[in-house]
C-alpha cells in the first residue's frame, strides 16, 4: 500500500493471486450473468421465450453446440480436444454476438460487455491451450455475409434469432464451465 493511506480508505488485505483456472471460471460466470441480463430484456419485450416456433429460425443458424466427439462430457472426456472445441466454439459465437449489438435498447452497454468479455475469455483460454494450431478461426467474409443475412430478416425472425443466440450461448458456456472444472 502506498504511503499516505488514510484510515477510512484502507486497501483490501493481500490474498492469494488468482490462478488461471479460477480466473477463467469467474470470467465465464461474468458472461453468464450478462446473458441473464440480456435475456430478461428479450423475454420482457416479446413472447419469444415461450414460443414453440423456434425450429423456423433455427434453420438459419449454425450455432456451436457441444457433441460427444468434442470430449467435453464426462464420458469420453479429453482435455485437449475439449479445450480446442471451447475456443473454436467461442470464436464461432463472435459473429452472433456482433449481431446482438444493435438488438437491445435499454441493455446496449450490457450487450457490449458480453461481447468484450467473450473476447477476453478467448484470450485467457488461448494462453491455456497447448495445441493452438488445431483451432480454426472463422472466415471473415463468411461471417460478414452471415451478419448481413441475419440483419435482413423480418422483425419476428430477428427477435427469435436474438432469443436463440442467447439461449445457445448460455448452454455452450455452461457446458464449457463444467468441462473446464475437470481440467
Amino acid at each position: 500500500v502506498p504511503p499516505g493511506e488514510d484510515s477510512k480508505d484502507v486497501a483490501a488485505p493481500h490474498r492469494q493471486p488468482l490462478t488461471s483456472s479460477e480466473r477463467i471460471d469467474k470470467q465465464i460466470r461474468y458472461i453468464l450473468d450478462g446473458i441473464s441480463a440480456l435475456r430478461k430484456e428479450t423475454c420482457n419485450k416479446s413472447n419469444m421465450c415461450e414460443s414453440s416456433k423456434e425450429a423456423l429460425a433455427e434453420n438459419n443458424l449454425n450455432l456451436p453446440k457441444m457433441a460427444e466427439k468434442d470430449g467435453c462430457f464426462q464420458s469420453g472426456f479429453n482435455e485437449e480436444t475439449c479445450l480446442v472445441k471451447i475456443i473454436t466454439g467461442l470464436l464461432e459465437f463472435e459473429v452472433y454476438l456482433e449481431y446482438l449489438q444493435n438488438r437491445f435498447e435499454s441493455s446496449e452497454e450490457q450487450a457490449r460487455a458480453v461481447q468484450m468479455s467473450t473476447k477476453v475469455l478467448i484470450q485467457f483460454l488461448q494462453k491455456k491451450a497447448k495445441n493452438l494450431d488445431a483451432i480454426t478461426t472463422p472466415d471473415p467474409t463468411t461471417n460478414a455475409s452471415l451478419l448481413t443475412k441475419l440483419q435482413a430478416q423480418n422483425q419476428w425472425l430477428q427477435d427469435m434469432t436474438t432469443h436463440l443466440i442467447l439461449r445457445s450461448f448460455k448452454e455452450f458456456l455452461q457446458s464449457s464451465l463444467r468441462a473446464l472444472r475437470q481440467m
Epitope: 484502507v10 486497501a11 490474498r15 493471486p17 488468482l18 461474468y30 450473468d33 450478462g34 468484450m116 477476453v120
Partner: nanobody, 131 residues
C-alpha cells in the same frame, strides 16, 4: 514474490506527454482490474483512471478526462497510462494497483477509483510537470 512495478515517470514541460507502464511479477496482471492513482505532496491520494479485466471498459476521473488514456495489453501482461496535455497540477507520484472490483457483471465502474477495491500496489513513479 508478488509485486507491481510502475515505470515511465519523469520531468516534462506543461502541455507535454508521458507514458506510464505497469507490469507485475508473481501474478498475472491480465486477471485483475487495474487502477492508476496519484498522490501530490500534502494531498490525499486520488484515483485517475481504471480498466476492467472482464470487459476492458474504462473509467476516468473528471480531472483527466480527454487527456489521459488507460489501456492494457494482455499478451504483454502490461497496463499503460498515456498522459497528454500535462499541467503542473498533474505533478504527483503515480501508483498502479490491481484488484477484483470488476468480476461481478453490472459492477459500478466509478467504484474502481476507491483504493479499498485493490489488493496489490506498486511503489510509484514520480511525474513532475514544470510550472
Amino acid at each position: 514474490q508478488v509485486q507491481l512495478v510502475e515505470s515511465g515517470g519523469g520531468l516534462v514541460q506543461p502541455g507535454g506527454s508521458l507514458g506510464l507502464s505497469c507490469a507485475a511479477s508473481g501474478f498475472t496482471l491480465a486477471y485483475y482490474g487495474i487502477g492508476w492513482f496519484r498522490q501530490a505532496p500534502g494531498k490525499e491520494r486520488e484515483g485517475v483512471a481504471c480498466i476492467s479485466s472482464s470487459d476492458l471498459s474504462t473509467y476516468y476521473a473528471d480531472s483527466v478526462k480527454g487527456r489521459f488514456t488507460i489501456s492494457r495489453d494482455n499478451a504483454k501482461d502490461t497496463v499503460y497510462l498515456q498522459m497528454n496535455s500535462l499541467k503542473p497540477e498533474d505533478t504527483a507520484v503515480y501508483y498502479c494497483a490491481a484488484g477484483t472490483w470488476d468480476l461481478k457483471f453490472g459492477y459500478s465502474r466509478s467504484n474502481c477509483v476507491r483504493s479499498y477495491e485493490y489488493d496489490y500496489w506498486g511503489q510509484g513513479t514520480q511525474v513532475t510537470v514544470l510550472s
